[in-house]
């Protein structure tokens, strides 16, 4: 498999058949598949070097792994997008052997002077062809030469099979399955041959190809493949339940932010709630996690403005639940990214020198910002797309807080909508779905560069649009939701999470 280890070294060679028998639309489809693969790999913070070859009668090398930009995913994608099926029109035979020789030439080195770490570099060849080679001879001989070069299968004690993977995608109207199977790697419990119809569900294909065991602690990563559970798609999501004898129970959501902490809303708890009465579950697991302590933001005080006629005041409505035992990360349990951390810098593929302010400008620019939250409907977690009103609609969004029960007498809306809040909901630019009571404490998320970054904590809403936990279809335009802006509570997060190795900026 493609071992995505951020500290490892990898070369990926993309080889695309542009011969007559492929056809323009299949060529374009294959290109799109490779673009998606580059993006998927880049989303792991891994920077492999890419080689890019198209071929028909002759190969054309577009990107060499030795080029300075070959590890720049955006640049490689640009080169790939600029390739035309017409590029091989005049010499449109199929010489797969020559194409693989071009890959060999990129991999190779003069006698005795291999590049440093040659024996620690993994090589992945992704060949997209119909297998109908009609000139140059059998391409399998070049695969043997590559294995020889990389010292694979020579030493019984150390066969090094992990260091070469050859994936073959059958593209085109007619595919010679025998030829394709012959070229692909054969490894136990791994799939190295894919068909055209597989390419309709690329996430499923990538799931077969990628070994992410070295990067389970990466924040904001998800799997969207069809066999995945709700928690493959939202692995940070935590369900919180507070049992109060004689008073029933309160349901909230939260987000895993580290191996020991879940971030949620402070209003989910009262000062009287004992740790043993708080149930937290993650990853869709039935068992509850043991709680060590709940840490409230020191400035949170729901009764803080009662004297001023404000019955409930949600400023600084954030809390961290510290778990007794360390979470074991896996594909259904992993952290979400937090603002102003090194993990988020890497997730957004920003330079290491990026400041907190620059992250803020990237994630919360002064405009309508596409975001999402996760809600549970009929026992299923679903993503709801909303827009954070952070530009010219911000004022009107915040003013609608006056329609909230108990806030109608508030003279100045900034009394309840402090600078700590982000506002969503309403009908412009689109009709946003609203949060329900049980969504409180869950993350408000920005999805960028295939990663998920939490920017807010769901706090309160103007209208309860979820009678009996069913969302009403028709909701008034003033149905707004308010979320604690994490950029505004960073000093507290930084202090409480200082031992969690998140690398706050």
């Amino acid at each position: 498999k493609i071992v995505l280890d951020p500290s490892g070294s990898m070369n990926i060679y993309l080889v695309l058949d542009g011969s007559d028998s492929i056809g323009a639309s299949n060529f374009t489809g294959a290109k799109k598949c490779l673009v998606n693969l580059i993006e998927k790999v880049a989303s792991y913070g891994v920077k492999p070097r890419y080689g890019l070859v198209t071929y028909a009668t002759y190969p054309k090398i577009w990107v060499k792994v030795s080029e300075a930009d070959s590890s720049n995913a955006d640049w490689v994608t640009k080169q790939l997008n600029e390739i035309n099926y017409e590029d091989h029109k005049l010499k449109s035979g199929t010489n797969t052997k020559k194409a693989l020789q071009a890959v060999y030439s990129m991999m190779s080195w003069p006698d005795d002077v291999p590049p440093e770490g040659w024996n620690r570099t993994r090589h992945v060849i992704i060949l997209m062809t119909d297998g109908l080679h009609n000139m140059g001879g059998d391409p399998i001989t070049v695969i043997d030469e590559i294995r020889d070069l990389l010292y694979i299968g020579k030493d019984r004690k150390n066969p090094r099979e992990d260091y070469l993977d050859v994936y073959v995608f059958g593209v085109g109207p007619l595919v010679n399955q025998v030829n394709i199977n012959a070229l692909a790697s054969k490894k136990d419990n791994e799939q190295h041959v894919f068909k055209v119809k597989d390419m309709e569900n690329l996430e499923d294909v990538f799931y077969q190809m990628i070994d992410e065991s070295q990067s389970l602690s990466l924040c904001g990563m998800v799997w969207e493949h069809r066999k995945g559970t709700d928690y493959h798609k939202q692995p940070w999501q935590a369900k919180i339940s507070v049992i109060r004898p004689s008073k029933g129970h309160e349901s909230c959501m939260g987000a895993v932010v580290s191996e020991y902490f879940v971030l949620t809303a402070a209003h989910c708890f009262t000062v009287d709630d004992k740790e043993h009465s708080i149930k937290v579950s993650v990853g869709g697991e039935k068992r509850d996690l043991e709680i060590e302590v709940v840490l409230f933001h020191p400035n949170y005080n729901i009764n803080g403005k009662k004297e001023a006629g404000i019955p409930e005041f949600y400023d600084y409505d954030v809390a961290l639940i510290k778990l007794k035992n360390k979470l074991k990360y896996g594909q259904t349990i992993r952290p979400i990214c937090l603002p102003c951390t090194e993990g988020t810098t890497r997730a957004l593929r920003l330079p290491p020198t990026t400041t907190c302010q620059q992250q803020k400008e990237e994630l919360l620019p002064a405009q309508d910002i596409k975001a999402l939250f996760v809600s549970e409907e009929e026992k299923k977690l679903t993503r709801k797309e909303v827009y954070i009103k952070n530009g010219d609609k911000k004022g009107s969004c915040e003013r609608d807080a006056q329609y909230a029960p108990g806030y109608d007498k508030v003279k100045d809306i900034s009394e309840v909508v402090t600078p700590r809040f982000l506002c969503t909901g309403g009908v412009s630019p689109y009709a946003d779905p609203n949060t329900c009571r049980g969504d409180s404490g869950g993350p408000l998320i920005v999805h960028k560069r295939s990663r998920f970054i939490q920017v807010g904590v769901i706090s309160w809403g103007v209208v309860d649009v979820c009678k009996n936990q069913k969302r009403q279809k028709q909701v008034p335009a003033h149905a707004r939701d308010f979320h604690i802006n994490l950029f505004q509570v960073l000093p507290w997060l930084k202090e409480k999470l200082q031992d969690e190795d998140l690398g706050f900026l």
């Epitope: 060499k64 030795s66 080029e67 990129m106 190779s108 003069p110 006698d111 005795d112 002077v113 440093e116």
Partner: antibody, heavy 118, light 112 residues
Framework: EVQLQQSGPELVKPGASVKMSCKAS????????MNWVKQSHGKSLEWIGR????????FYNQRFKGKATLTVDKSSSTAHMELRSLTSEDSALYYC???????????WGQGTLVTVSA | DIVMTQAAFSNPVTLGTSASISCSSS???????????LYWYLQRPGQSPQLLIY???NLASGVPDRFSGSGSGTDFTLRISRVEAEDVGVYYC?????????FGGGTKLEIK
């Protein structure tokens, strides 16, 4: 600190043989190819050959085949070069140099001066 | 064998000014992998050679960034941006594309 310590100067008679050494320290001896380079007085550098200390496999510049023999002693992390049938043409400064992948000869010994004279 | 050619002496340079040393090869040193296997060494008087530049344009560890290497497949240049007294010596180019590895005759840097 990586060091290549070469044996002292040699004064030898024509037709005789000489064996010089290069003791490596500060790194894993078997991990890098050891090379030998000749520098005749006031002249350029000439690559003689290299040896792989891991398995003793040697490769020679055709010009020095039959003239030079490269060997290693892994137990003492020492490379040796023997030159035979010496003539005045072999009078030169001989360097050992460590080859580090494709970075080139990153470390050199201080050289062994061989003088062939009757 | 690949022949490396250098002029025996550089044009005399003044300390603090820049100097260029040239080298050419009888065959292109550009490998099919895209890397050019050309190296520069400096031998100061009475010392062993020292690696300056590897793979045509990469600065070796510990070498001041006053030194830089450039070139095409067969013609190469070593540039010293501000010559200092310690830069005096003989500069050798070498190729590692094909065995036997070969060195140029060396260029002596002359100070005015």
């Amino acid at each position: 600190e990586v060091q290549l310590q070469q044996s002292g100067p040699e004064l030898v008679k024509p037709g005789a043989s000489v064996k010089m050494s290069c003791k490596a320290s500060g790194y894993s001896f078997t991990d890098y190819l050891m090379n030998w380079v000749k520098q005749s007085h006031g002249k350029s550098l000439e690559w003689i050959g290299r040896i792989n200390p891991y398995n003793g496999d040697a490769f020679y510049n055709q010009r020095f085949k039959g003239k030079a023999t490269l060997t290693v002693d892994k137990s003492s992390s020492t490379a040796h070069m023997e030159l035979r049938s010496l003539t005045s043409e072999d009078s030169a400064l001989y360097y050992c140099a460590r080859l580090e992948n494709d970075y080139g000869f990153t470390y050199w010994g201080q050289g062994t001066l061989v003088t062939v004279s009757a | 064998d690949i022949v490396m050619t250098q002029a025996a002496f550089s044009n005399p340079v003044t300390l603090g000014t820049s100097a260029s040393i040239s080298c050419s090869s009888s065959k292109s040193l550009l490998h099919s992998n895209g890397i050019t296997y050309l190296y520069w060494y400096l031998q100061r008087p009475g010392q062993s050679p020292q690696l300056l530049i590897y793979r045509m344009s990469n600065l070796a560890s510990g070498v001041p960034d006053r030194f830089s290497g450039s070139g095409s497949g067969t013609d190469f240049t070593l540039r010293i941006s501000r010559v200092e007294a310690e830069d005096v010596g003989v500069y050798y180019c070498a190729q590692m594309l094909e065995r036997p590895w070969t060195f140029g005759g060396g260029t002596k840097l002359e100070i005015k």
